[in-house]
Interface confidence: low
Amino acid sequence: NLGLDCDEHSSESRCCRYPLTVDFEAFGWDWIIAPKRYKANYCSGQCEYMFMQKYPHTHLVQQANPRGSAGPCCTPTKMSPINMLYFNDKQQIIYGKIPGMVVDRCGCS
Amino acid sequence: NLGLDCDEHSSESRCCRYPLTVDFEAFGWDWIIAPKRYKANYCSGQCEYMFMQKYPHTHLVQQANPRGSAGPCCTPTKMSPINMLYFNDKQQIIYGKIPGMVVDRCGCS
């Protein structure tokens, strides 16, 4: 399942990955030394019946339709890390790989 | 992140894992030999700001608030497989581990 890629000009209404650059400086997150900005991407769109479902379970829950289940939603199904240089709580400089920072793929789950 | 577990008597409104037994016979899925039913569970509930977020990315997208981003939703963050005996498309009996069948944990992403 490769997922769909869209941009702000796309007419796609279904679950899709869109580009998004996160700017830490714009947020005032001054404890992040580098990168100051990075391509994070995000997921948006409708989850039609059986479209882009990551798990068999998603379809089964739609079939069973239990109380309170809102149906699948468009959410990251594959994420990747980025390397970051930042101050920790003790004001020490840390270099580390931070997981779950970039959306590589979107799907319905 | 341990997630929350609820049942039908819970007053919890936030993202939570609920019990759900899937009955293949009730669905008329007669190509499944075993199990005839299994505990699948499902996710339901609200995703408040910063609550049960699986990824830093989820928080960052809320901060950036791009066009069309609907905010995080309550979705499986950990799944597990079950072993199944079933007829494939060629009417051969297959025994295999089917991924993404059981929700072990729910979160906001």
């Epitope: - | 341990l2 929350l4 919890e12 928080h59």
Partner: antibody, heavy 119, light 107 residues
Amino acid sequence: QVQLVQSGGGLVKPGGSLRLSCAASGFTFSSYSMNWVRQAPGKGLEWVSSISSSSSYIYYADSVKGRFTISRDNAKNSLYLQMNSLRAEDTAVYYCARDRGYTFGVDYWGQGTTVTVSS
Amino acid sequence: AIQMTQSPSSLSASVGDRVTITCRASQGIRNDLGWYQQKPGKAPKRLIYAASSLQSGVPSRFSGSGSGTEFTLTISSLQPEDFATYYCLQHNSYPYTFGQGTKVEIK
């Protein structure tokens, strides 16, 4: 260094209003969620309200909902708590506190300001 | 709302004693918990964040442990300046909630 300097406390009659202020310095105020926490005389700490860095997300304790309003002015590095329809049970020392979210949570606190509601 | 049950509500101890205070959350809160010390007429001061990380500048005799629903603050060797009231705070979800507090008094 991080400093949170509070003002605006005082004596007020039941049903009256008061506005608390918290002036921040020593850090990038616009980066952080902020909280108000209170402590009634001889009692424990009670969270009152939170506001996210850009004011997009605001939360209140049930005990103050509809009566108190939290706000912030990032240009002035200031946090506010507007308290209306005050009751005797709102009598407390009120603290502002910085919130780093995620792992880091609530770290620095103001010195506190006393609010007394009495006729 | 998540309830934080702190125990004991008070304890008497001597200088040099090992002191343990516990907080139990009514549901899982990962490690989203801090421990705070408060002295009369003063603002709370954070000792521990993320359940087990020592706040910068806090003596190493203070330590925290736990995850999920059970958390512990330990003072390995009580010092005269440690006589105070201690609170836990969960910041996993709103409304944030404190434990009821534990007053540590001189025996």
